[in-house]
């Protein structure tokens, strides 16, 4: 959380924006919140990036402002217009890219004073796991897919039953490239899984966390998938 | 050159199922924002349904349940599964490309008439 | 759902006058995400103006976009005879993810 104060002339007024992940090829939002006013046309909402010399996408006097917009977010930003009043400044980015990363700085001028914070934003991609028994090996066998990582991931098996093992010497993972050249399937085998425990595929890279449990029984096989977005820090 | 082709349309009866196909050339489907985009006959324009570059997918309500968008990075084509098809369905259908700023690039259109 | 509605419904105009046509949306829309499109019979939509006011590649500089929240603006300065079509507003974010206009015939007068 990164908590921001403005400087001389009038007031300073708090604003605050959380260190965010992007996952390419969806929809990304920048976090940014501040001491709201209770007029909208004395709110000015500023988005910059660090590097870049236009403007990531300007709000004020209750509209857009896209007249300085760099051409690298041309069509693709929006702020949240009815949620501005509240105090969120948040921005939403269309079809994150790599390029997208870096430093951002959401700039606040109300009628109360100005602030700024800057937020870390992070792309990459990830995606669930889906963990199913390979009926096609020789052995008991788990097979550990996700389609879609960047960076590339480590990938860790765990079991409950024999909680603390390694399993690295009898798992087998491999990153095949996708089509569009940047991202990355992420497929890991197990070896020699016993009836009745519950195993766990772990998948994590500096950006997301995803495991995928699977518990097989003799009558059944019960699956379980979550993912968890890393460095979410508030400033 | 930036084209789209869809193929796929023709006569069906309430009820059936088709599934249509857009070959792309000149860009990577899967990195863009990929679009079914239908028009009844005389009618405006109506969103389906879309894939974003990650895979993941999105419909009209209209839609939901009966059609899915996927597609063949391998083959760089979009398709449209439709099933249960009503006699609503009966239009002109659109892939379309969103390279971030509004559709930029569309195919000539395949017609799906649903009629017993 | 943001509904998008324009108008008017038809505009006659003879080649050389200068068309206007309006699209309100039933909720602020971001101008980044407000285009407009042309079609013409038999043909597909064809990108006109993206993020409200620019021009997409290729698109004669008589063809402008403006507006901002819930009003937005499609002008022609000078109609050419080639013009004459139907002209849809569309937006981009909310649910449904992509909505459309119902359009407006722009007829020869």
């Known amino acids: 959380l990164i908590i921001g104060f403005g400087i001389s002339g009038r007031h300073s007024i708090t604003v605050t924006t959380v260190a965010s992940a992007g996952n390419i090829g969806e929809d990304g939002i920048l976090s940014c919140t501040f001491e709201p006013d209770i007029k909208l046309s004395d709110i000015v909402i500023q988005w910059l990036k660090e590097g870049v010399l236009g403007l990531v996408h300007e709000f004020k006097e209750g509209k857009d402002e896209l007249s300085e917009q760099d051409e690298m977010f041309r069509g693709r930003t929006a702020v949240f217009a009815d949620q501005v009043i509240v105090g969120n400044a948040s921005l939403r980015l269309k079809n994150v890219q790599l390029t997208d990363a870096g430093t951002y700085k959401c700039y606040i001028i109300t009628s109360k004073g100005k602030g700024n914070a800057n937020l870390e934003y992070k792309t990459g991609a990830f995606s669930m796991p889906e963990v199913n028994v390979d009926y096609n090996a020789s052995s008991e066998t788990l097979r550990c897919e996700a389609p879609r990582w960047f960076p590339q991931p480590t990938v860790v098996w765990a079991s409950q039953v024999d909680q603390g093992a390694n399993f690295s010497e009898v798992s087998n993972t491999s990153f095949e490239l996708n089509s569009e050249n940047v991202t990355m399937k992420v497929v890991s085998v197990l070896y020699n899984v016993t009836i009745n425990n519950t195993y766990s595929c772990m998948i994590e890279n500096d950006i997301a966390k995803a495991t995928g449990d699977i518990k097989v029984t003799e009558s059944e096989i019960k699956r379980r998938s979550h993912l968890q977005l890393l460095n979410s820090k508030a400033s | 050159e930036v084209q789209l082709v869809e193929s796929g349309g023709g006569l069906i009866q309430p009820g059936g199922s088709l599934r249509l196909s857009c070959a792309a050339s000149?860009?990577?489907?899967?990195?863009?924002?990929m679009n079914w985009v239908r028009q009844a006959p005389g009618k405006g324009l109506e969103w389906v349904s879309v894939i974003y570059g990650s895979g993941r997918t999105d419909a009209a309500d209209s839609v939901k349940g009966r059609f899915t968008i996927s597609r063949d990075n391998s083959k760089n084509t979009l398709y449209l599964q439709m099933n249960s098809l009503r006699a609503e369905d009966t239009a002109v259908y659109y892939c379309?490309?969103?390279?971030?700023?509004?559709?930029?690039?569309w195919g000539q259109g395949t017609t799906v008439t649903v009629s017993s | 759902e943001i509904v998008l509605t324009q108008s008017p419904g038809t505009l006659s105009l003879s080649p050389g006058e200068r068309a206007t046509l309006s699209c309100r949306a039933s909720q602020s829309v971001s101008s980044s995400y407000l285009a407009w499109y042309q079609q013409k019979p038999g043909q597909a939509p064809r990108l006109l103006i993206y993020g409200a006011s620019s021009r997409a590649t290729g698109i004669p500089d008589r063809f402008s976009g403006s507006g901002s929240g819930t009003d937005f603006t499609l002008t022609i300065s000078r109609l050419e005879p080639e013009d004459f079509a139907v002209y849809y507003c569309q937006q981009y974010g909310s649910s449904p993810l992509y909505t459309f206009g119902q359009g407006t015939k722009l007829e020869i007068k």
């Open positions: 000149g860009f990577i489907v899967s990195r863009n924002y």
């Open positions: 379309a490309r969103d390279a971030d700023y509004g559709l930029d690039v």
